[in-house]
């Protein structure tokens, strides 16, 4: 018989797989229909009747073609340090991303398990490497001739202004102060900022220590306290 003529359930020919969007039911020993995303198997197939599918209930989902008896629970609501970038629907789990000024310190299969605030470099230190969705800011001491007088996760070290006559020499955390005669060269007013990382990757997190009821193939890794990097300050 030409392929895809038999209706489910049917016994496959020896050595043959089931067809598209079908599964082999070991109990019935038949090829049966899978349930589409957004549904689950309410009644499994038998030798004479196909799978009966039903829609997922509120706050549950199935993302794949399946024959699971129950839909998966959507993850818990996004925490205050996150933004919901994908709502929980019958076909997809909720996805949360870290809000601006935060990064994903511990990711999971789809999204983020734990957001943390981006490190702020204290005066005397500037941003050596800006934060990203998944990495913290790296601070570095301002080199001679440069300074940073802010506590910031975006400001880099800026050159001291050059004075005709120096009133107070600059240091790592303070600009040079010139005498009343104007400096020969001055940086543009205002701090130099690095752009904030933009979160585009799908992320989802659990804001509370309690495990979500949603099964996950990723593992919760232990995360001990980490010492602050030199020149950084906690929030």
């Amino acid at each position: 018989l030409p392929a895809q003529v038999a209706f489910t359930p049917y016994a496959p020919e020896p050595g043959s797989t089931c067809r598209l969007r079908e599964y082999y039911d070991q109990t019935a020993q038949m090829c049966c229909s899978k349930c589409s995303p957004g549904q689950h198997a309410k009644v499994f197939c038998t030798k004479t009747s196909d799978t009966v599918c039903d829609s997922c209930e509120d706050s549950t989902y199935t993302q794949l073609w399946n024959w699971v008896p129950e839909c998966l629970s959507c993850g818990s609501r996004c925490s205050s340090d996150q933004v919901e970038t994908q709502a929980c629907t019958r076909e997809q789990n909720r996805i949360c991303t870290c809000r601006p000024g935060w990064y994903c310190a511990l990711s999971k299969q789809e999204g983020c398990r734990l957001c943390a605030p981006l490190r702020k470099c204290r005066p005397g230190f500037g941003v050596a490497r800006p934060g990203t969705e998944t990495s913290d800011v790296v601070c570095k001491p301002c080199a001679p001739g440069t300074f940073s007088n802010t506590t910031s996760s975006t400001d880099i070290c800026r050159p001291h202004q050059i004075c005709n006559v120096v009133a107070i020499p600059g240091n790592a955390s303070m600009d040079a102060v010139c005498t009343s005669t104007s400096p020969t060269r001055s940086m543009a007013p205002g701090a130099v900022h690095l752009p904030q990382p933009v979160s585009t990757r799908s992320q989802h997190t659990q804001p509370t220590p309690e495990p979500s009821t949603a099964p996950s193939t990723s593992f919760l890794l232990p995360m001990g306290p980490s010492p602050p990097a030199e020149g950084s300050t906690g929030d």
Partner: antibody, heavy 119, light 107 residues
């Protein structure tokens, strides 16, 4: 990274057989179908069939039943396809491709093996 | 078997142009329509599956639409690296079948 690497080009005489190989790496070999697709010179693509490495079961395009045999060696993550009774119109590039049986697509392809059938 | 008819079979366009290719199935295939790009001497590459889902890593200038029997593949702004042959393929019913291809050239 996920890849499929195929064996080298073959030149065969009409009536002969050829056995092509496709070695998978970068993913769990037994969880995805390996499909075979061929492309005659200057022509389009033609699906031959798939094999499910977990149990070795297959699904064929009717046009290739009795013409092609698909097997796997789970220990080396390699799929094979033998094509028998070769004719000049079997001259083609033969591709292996990882398939998705829910949406019917091929997301990872081998580089192809050129089979030339000539007397 | 389901026949897939692609049109045009070839087309020429300029960099920056919006390019549209159509694919017609001989019977209803729901949304089970996939699109591939094939460059000379290379294997096909999956661009779009299930009518409009973009494969990971594929630029957003590629898109797909349609349903039932009539489908459209669009490149919103043609880039030099898009020169290739494009194939549609139905994933609804066995045997899996491909369109005849559309060869895209730069004007």
């Amino acid at each position: 990274q996920v890849q499929l690497v195929q064996s080298g080009a073959e030149v065969k005489k009409p009536g002969a057989s050829v056995k092509l190989s496709c070695k998978a790496s970068g993913y769990t070999f037994i969880t995805y179908d390996i499909n075979w697709v061929r492309q005659a010179p200057g022509q389009g693509l033609e699906w031959i069939g798939w094999i499910y490495p977990r149990d070795g079961n297959t699904q064929f395009n009717e046009n290739f039943k009795g013409k092609a045999t698909m097997t796997v060696d789970e220990s080396t993550s390699t799929a094979y396809m033998e094509v028998r009774s070769l004719r000049s119109d079997d001259t083609a590039v033969y591709y292996c491709a990882r398939g998705d049986r829910d949406y019917g697509y091929f997301d990872v392809w081998g580089q192809g093996t050129t089979v030339t059938v000539s007397s | 078997d389901i026949q897939m008819t692609q049109s045009p079979s070839s087309l020429s366009a300029s960099v920056g142009d919006r390019v549209t290719i159509t694919c017609q199935a001989s019977q209803d295939i729901s949304n089970y329509l996939n699109w591939y790009q094939q460059k000379p001497g290379k294997a096909p590459k999956l661009l779009i599956y299930f009518k409009s889902k973009l494969e990971t890593g594929v630029p957003s200038r590629f898109s797909g639409s349609g349903s039932g029997t009539d489908f459209t593949f669009t490149i919103s702004s043609l880039q030099p690296e898009d020169i290739a042959t494009y194939y549609c393929q139905q994933g609804n019913t066995l045997p899996l079948t491909f369109g005849g291809g559309t060869k895209l050239e730069i004007k």
